[in-house]
């Protein structure tokens, strides 16, 4: 956020940029949390995303029995590895075809024991506040489907009739990692020393990191004719004075007519 300064007062302004603001020759360049001519004002909303999508990664091991292991399979750039990768990927795409969150598989290692395939199953979902539940459900379906296929697609009389065959006992889920996204935590961190006063509110399933000085939310502070300003002790209403009234009170809701006050004083004098 930037505010431009013109005229003779600019040199003075340069040395007075506050809150880590820097002078660029024309104006104070303010850090994310501040705005105003001197970066003296605290913003009332902070952009915290969210990311468009959230990902999960499942580390799995399956044992493929329909391919005999050769040393070349250890070399990821070999013709053998590339072909195995293509067939395995195609097979897994079939296995997981009913899972909307499924993105693909990534083979990390092939080792001896028929062919033991260490791989990641990659999942992704659009961000919603329920993303954890969505991905948890998807990982459960992955487990069910891989268990089913490695039980059904097995060698009979040392021959496989399917695209790939598996060892039923060789299927293991090692680890599940979900990208963590915690809007409340992000909001608190980005608000720094004002973290106690910023909260997350949702609108159309999108999180907004706001202080009570941001209008239009359930936590918004109504300062009436005054201006909401954030300080280290929290949001405060700065009350205005008009030609006819003084305003006071915590929400600037108490108006005192100047003429009455002047009239009163005049009466005393």
């Amino acid at each position: 956020r930037t505010t431009t300064c013109f005229g003779d007062g600019c040199q003075n302004t340069a040395s007075r940029c506050k809150n880590g603001g820097t002078w660029d020759g024309l104006k104070c360049q303010c850090p994310n949390l501040y705005y105003g001519e001197l970066c003296e004002e605290v913003v009332s909303s902070i952009d915290i995303g969210p990311p468009e999508t959230i990902s999960a990664q499942m580390e799995l091991t399956v044992t493929v029995t329909s391919v005999k292991f050769t040393e070349e399979l250890k070399n990821h750039s070999s013709q053998e590895f590339q072909e195995f990768k293509q067939t395995f990927t195609e097979q897994m795409n079939i296995v997981y075809s009913g899972i909307p969150e499924y993105v693909g598989v990534n083979i990390t290692k092939l080792r001896l024991g028929s062919v033991v395939v260490e791989h990641d199953v990659l999942l992704r979902t659009k961000y919603t506040p329920e993303y954890k539940t969505v991905l948890d459900n998807a990982t459960e379906v992955v487990k069910e489907k891989i268990t089913k296929v490695t039980t059904q697609q097995i060698m009979i009389n040392d021959i496989c009739s399917d695209m790939m065959c598996f060892n039923t006992t060789g299927t293991q889920v090692q680890n599940i990692t979900v990208t963590q996204y915690d809007p409340e935590e992000d909001c608190r961190k980005m608000a720094k020393e004002y973290g106690d006063y910023f909260v997350v509110e949702y609108r159309d399933q999108k999180p907004y990191c706001i202080s009570p000085c941001e209008p239009g939310f359930s936590v918004s502070k109504n300062c009436n004719l005054g201006k909401c300003q954030m300080s280290l002790s929290g949001p405060q209403c700065l009350c205005v004075t008009t030609e006819t009234h003084w305003y006071s009170g915590e929400t600037c809701n108490q108006g005192t007519q100047k003429s009455l006050v002047y009239g009163h004083h005049h009466h005393h004098h």
Epitope: S66, V67, K68, E80, E83, C160, S161, M163, M164, C165
Partner: nanobody, 124 residues
């Protein structure tokens, strides 16, 4: 990339013999799998036989056991199928297939490389 070219198809009388050949090129290793599949009109493609070029394994479909012989000449990188005692039901397009892996599957989807096919007709 791996290329496969079949030859040797033709018309033969029941009880007769035929020898199919398949020349392979593009392999980086001398140990891989090769197979013969066939597809009769209106039917699905099915395995006839496969072989590992290191001599480690051969497989035959029950319908051709004792009549057909699969072999591979490493020096020529060529696959053969010797077909004896041919029957009318052997009539089909015969395809050569290959994989750089040592495959033990008879499912065509596992085999990535294919020739264009050669027609074998057994008829009197």
């Amino acid at each position: 990339d791996v290329q496969l070219v079949e030859s040797g198809g033709g018309v033969v009388q029941p009880g007769g013999s035929l020898r199919l050949s398949c020349a392979a090129s593009g392999y980086t290793s001398n140990r891989y799998s090769m197979a013969w599949f066939r597809q009769a009109p209106g039917k699905e493609r099915e395995v006839v036989a496969f072989i590992w070029t290191d001599g480690g394994r051969t497989y035959y479909a029950d319908s051709v056991k004792g009549r057909f012989t699969i072999s591979h000449d490493n020096s020529k990188n060529t696959l053969y199928l010797q077909m004896n005692s041919l029957r009318a039901e052997d009539t089909a397009v015969y395809y050569c297939a290959a994989s750089s892996l040592l495959l033990q599957t008879i499912n065509p989807r596992a085999w990535p490389y294919w020739g264009q096919g050669t027609m074998v007709t057994v008829s009197s």
